[in-house]
Interface confidence: low
């Protein structure tokens, strides 16, 4: 019996290097480690609300409080970062709202990356008033422990003054910190008394000491950097999508699959099809056809568009998404009506997602 090939018999060789796939971006809530975070589930008429984090059910514990439509995280840590979802279950349907939580010291030392206020830290002294180095803004130095997700930017600041103007140098784990000690080096902004490391990696963990000195004295301050490795998750598909649809013969229809994935996802659209008038082979198993495929002659693989549909196009359409961690799939049904019947959007019923490690 003949098998089905990919769209227009394309081979599996990608024509160009895969690019980072443009995925749906949920709202992002940012908190610093130790802070408390409260998020309200932005869904209407929510009788029963359930919560998930990275696709896994979230229950209350000593730091996570679930009250009505509110999620509270007390004393947030970088491990609380991830993709959250609240699902409102109603009598006839359910709806899901996604949001990201990012617990990070992304730009550390309590300061914006562009250092707009940095010039205030550069104190000019009267030339006759000799003075040993001193800290000019200890508030920006209070937080000594910085836990930062990998790939983020870190900035440590030691705003100081003195006369003559002190110099600043940096040590890592008590030894001179050289540019070649890390891939990509680092930046020192002397005018802002700051050390900046972009795209941190686990090997950047350690103690960073600023030494500020002039001929009248020396002061130092040590920060501890912990780089938290991100745990990517398998793809998560927005509940309710793809949605069941109906159209008349000759009409057009679109199925949409919204994907949340922090690793590049690969999307497939698969259909149960008929062969020789049957949906099942002699072995009782369904015939399948891969209709669309991200990365192979496909644009916007999150959308499957069907034009000029016939009755043969009716049936179940599966959106299957994978990344290097795992995969998930959800499906929807297309009903094709005779031309005299007016089409209507069906109630959105979600097939059970198949989340797999």
């Amino acid at each position: 019996r003949p098998s089905f090939s990919l769209v227009e018999d394309t081979t599996l060789e990608p024509e160009e290097p895969p690019t980072k796939y443009q995925i749906s971006q949920p709202e992002v809530y940012v908190a610093a480690p130790g802070e408390s975070l409260e998020v309200r589930c932005l869904l209407k008429d929510a009788a029963v609300i359930s919560w998930t984090k990275d696709g896994v059910h979230l229950g209350p514990n000593n730091r996570t409080v679930l009250i009505g439509e509110y999620l509270q995280i007390k004393g947030a840590t970088p491990r609380d970062s991830g993709l959250y979802a609240c699902t409102a279950s109603r009598t006839v349907d359910s709806e899901t709202w996604y949001f990201m939580v990012n617990v990070t010291d992304a730009i550390s030392s309590g300061d914006d990356e562009d250092d707009t206020d940095g010039a205030e830290d550069f104190v000019s002294e009267n030339s006759n008033n000799k003075r040993a180095p001193y800290w000019t803004n200890t508030e920006k130095m209070e937080k000594r422990l910085h836990a930062v997700p990998a790939a983020n930017t870190v900035k440590f600041r030691c705003p100081a003054g003195g006369n003559p103007m002190p110099t600043m140098r940096w040590l890592k784990n008590g030894k001179e910190f050289k540019q070649e000690h890390r891939i990509g080096g680092y930046k020192v902004r002397n005018q802002h008394w700051s050390l900046i490391m972009e795209s941190v990696v686990p090997s950047d963990k350690g103690n960073y000491t600023c030494v500020v000195e002039n001929e009248y004295g020396s002061i130092n301050h040590t920060y501890h950097l912990d780089v938290v490795e991100r745990s990517p998750h398998r793809p998560i598909l927005q509940a309710g999508l793809p949605a069941n649809a109906s159209t008349v013969v000759g009409g057009d229809v679109e199925f949409v699959c919204k994907v949340y994935s922090d690793a590049q996802p690969h999307i497939q659209w698969i259909k149960h099809v008929e062969k020789n008038g049957s949906k099942y082979g002699p072995d009782g198993l369904p015939y399948l056809k891969v209709l669309k495929h991200s990365g192979i002659n496909s644009s916007n693989a999150e959308v499957l568009a069907l034009f000029n549909v016939t009755e043969a196009d009716a049936g179940e359409y599966i959106c299957k998404v994978s990344n290097y961690i795992g995969q998930a799939n959800q499906s929807a049904w297309l009903t094709v009506l005779p031309k005299q019947q007016a089409p209507g959007r069906e109630k959105e019923i979600t097939a059970s997602p198949d989340y797999l490690e």
């Epitope: 990608p14 690793a263 497939q268 698969i270 994978s322 799939n329 490690e357």
Partner: antibody, heavy 120, light 107 residues
Framework: DVHLQESGPGLVKPSQSLSLTCSVT?????????WNWIRQFPGNKLEWMGY???????NYNPSLKNRLSITRDTSKNQFFLQLSSLTTEDTATYFC?????????????WGTGTTVTVSS | SIVMTQTPKILLVSAGDRVTITCKAS??????VAWYQQKPGQSPKLLIY???NRYTGVPDRFTGSGYGTDFTFTISTVQAEDLAVYFC?????????FGSGTKLEIK
């Protein structure tokens, strides 16, 4: 045409580490695909060991996770297997192979394989 | 991990026979199943992917079918060059796993 070729020692002593190289020609390992190591034990049993993706991410078989490391040298278009704490159970033919992506259901190009015997 | 139970272990065939090999997954693997042919001293060669799609250049006497947990591989008319070991494989869920193999031998 894309070709994969494994190389490494044929004989290794128990408790030592095994290092194998897969040299890829005809395709850049940073352009696409996941680059795998698979081994075949005497008696034909195949075991997927793990892969490194075109962008450098790894996925390992949990049964080997604490002993296995797969790395790459993009300048030489090679990827590597390092398996530590060998026992005689690791005696097998080791293949490198590529797969288009997780869930694509196929290893479309394989190396010829290199036989490794673990024996004192 | 998912176990792929492949049967039979050995198939005694004659040229022209129709041959069917089955693979049963211990849990659903959707259509993420491939079939490989391995001849003595060679590496496995891909024949079927996505359970039923023939790989480029594979003769149409080789077919695959199945979805979920039950998969079959068929050679409609066995030829002498088909004598080999055949493996099924799933990459639906990591760790990816293979069947134990079916050896085609001449009667």
């Amino acid at each position: 045409d894309v070709h994969l070729q494994e190389s490494g020692p044929g004989l290794v002593k128990p408790s030592q580490s095994l290092s194998l190289t897969c040299s890829v020609t005809g395709y850049s390992i940073t352009s696409g695909y996941y680059w795998n190591w698979i081994r075949q034990f005497p008696g034909n049993k195949l075991e997927w060991m793990g892969y490194i993706t075109y962008d450098g991410s790894n996925n390992y078989n949990p049964s080997l996770k604490n002993r296995l490391s797969i790395t790459r040298d993009t300048s030489k278009n090679q990827f590597f297997l390092q398996l530590s704490s060998l026992t005689t159970e690791d005696t097998a033919t080791y293949f490198c192979a590529r797969v288009y992506y997780y869930g694509s259901g196929n290893f479309d190009v394989w190396g010829t394989g290199t036989t490794v015997t673990v024996s004192s | 991990s998912i176990v792929m139970t492949q049967t039979p272990k050995i198939l005694l065939v004659s040229a022209g026979d129709r041959v069917t090999i089955t693979c049963k997954a211990s849990q659903s693997v959707s259509n993420d199943v491939a079939w490989y042919q391995q001849k003595p001293g060679q590496s496995p060669k891909l024949l079927i992917y996505y359970a039923s799609n023939r790989y480029t250049g594979v003769p149409d006497r080789f077919t695959g079918s199945g979805y979920g947990t039950d998969f079959t591989f068929t050679i409609s008319t066995v030829q002498a060059e088909d004598l080999a070991v055949y493996f099924c494989h799933q990459d639906h869920t990591s760790p990816f796993t293979f069947g134990s193999g079916t050896k085609l031998e001449i009667k």
